[in-house]
Interface confidence: medium
């Protein structure tokens, strides 16, 4: 598998999107997980409804939800409030008995120009201009990273 | 006048604790995050924490370097910010500055040996 | 970490002529609304750093229009466009988009 990587700035919303061959995976549950050091193991964040037929239904664990279009094909997990703890590889799982097929791995990067947070009027580099009236506008930036573009980063 | 004083450096040993303050005047200090970046001896600087402002929960950030050692903390009232370093090693050894990225202190020098 | 590469490291330049110093990124800096955060500081002798340019290419408060800055993505440029005495020390580009912020190595500028 090759890893995506999706961008957030950080106190907004990150949306991650798994794309898979909903006949596939076809009555499987869905989950999303931390990968843990480069061999460890994927925690589970958040997992899809228990019952397959409701898996339309939000599920939420702290600041993360998992909704799954299951005739679509795709998996979406909205990471809110985004924070640098949140910076890390992750998993799109498909679930089956006690194995998990991985779908797609993520590399959610956080984003924070420090300046961002000022109001206009309260910046102290006279001349800055921009506009910050969309500061609070959820974004987000996806690209495909091969596998070992980036070294691993250490897990905090 | 923008103004950024940093006190509280000197010369300890390894394992022990420090308190850095950077007293501040001349901007709006409560709505600017504030930084302690430092620059090694050899002369390359490195960002090793922020502290955000009342609206952000004055959260805070830490560089892998120092996470878990060091504490960064602020007073608006006082204009002030802080670094409570615990547990130095050699290589903490470096000027350290107060910075709103845009204005920096003068520095001060932190020396950790034996 | 977003790894940032100077060059040249050092650079010696007769007053009056133009200096270039180039800065490239591990990864792009490209943020939001088409903001660009790359900095650019100057360490003069003895003294803190300055901010000389924000975000790619906005000049700071009291900075000669001499000083500018450009790039992409991922590689960027520093342009002093007639030096003067009082321009030599360090120059750093920064980064403050993605944690940890980092620093390039710096590139010493000296006159001829």
């Known amino acids: 598998h090759n890893t995506t990587v999706f961008q957030g700035v950080e106190g907004q919303s990150l949306q991650v999107s798994c794309p898979y061959d909903s006949m596939k995976h076809w009555g499987r549950r869905k989950a999303w997980c931390r990968q843990l050091g480069e061999k460890g193991p994927c925690q589970r964040v958040v997992s899809t409804h228990n019952l397959w037929l409701l898996s339309f239904l939000r599920r939420r664990n702290g600041s993360t939800a998992i909704t799954d279009d299951t005739l679509g094909g795709t998996l979406t997990i909205t990471l809110r409030n985004l924070q640098p703890h949140d910076a890390g590889f992750y998993q799109c799982q498909s679930l089956h008995g006690s194995e998990a097929d991985t779908l797609r791995k993520v590399l959610v990067e956080v984003l924070a120009d420090p300046l961002d947070h000022r109001d206009a009027g309260d910046l102290w580099v006279p001349g800055e201009s921009e506009s910050f009236e969309d500061a609070h506008v959820e974004h987000s930036i996806s690209r495909s990273l091969l596998e070992g573009e980036i070294p691993f980063p250490p897990t905090s | 006048e923008v103004q950024l004083v940093e006190t509280g450096g000197s010369l300890v040993q390894p394992g022990k604790s420090l308190k850095l303050t950077c007293a501040t005047s001349g901007f709006p200090f409560s709505n600017v995050w504030m930084h302690w970046v430092r620059q090694s001896p050899e002369k390359q600087l490195e960002w090793i924490a922020h502290i955000k402002a009342k609206s952000d929960n004055y959260a805070t950030y830490y560089a892998e370097s120092v996470k878990g050692r060091f504490t960064i903390s602020r007073d608006d009232s006082k204009t002030s910010i802080y670094l409570q370093m615990n547990s130095l090693k050699e290589d903490d050894t470096a000027i350290y500055y107060c910075t709103g990225l845009d204005y920096w202190g003068q520095g001060v020098m932190v020396t950790v040996s034996s | 970490d977003t790894v940032l590469t100077q060059a040249p490291l050092s650079l010696s330049v007769t007053p009056g002529e133009s200096a270039s110093i180039s800065c490239r990124s591990s990864k792009s800096l490209l943020g939001v609304r088409d903001i660009t955060s790359l900095y650019w500081y100057l360490q003069k002798p003895g003294k803190s750093p300055q901010l000389l340019i924000y975000?790619?290419?906005n000049l700071a408060s009291g900075v000669p229009d001499r000083f500018s800055g450009s790039g992409s993505e991922t590689d960027f440029t520093l342009k002093i466009s007639e030096v003067e005495t009082e321009d030599v020390g360090v120059y750093y580009c920064?980064?403050?988009?993605?944690?940890?912020?980092?620093f390039g190595p710096g590139t010493k500028l000296e006159l001829k």
């Open positions: 920064a980064q403050f988009l993605r944690y940890p912020y980092t």
């Open positions: 975000r790619m290419s």
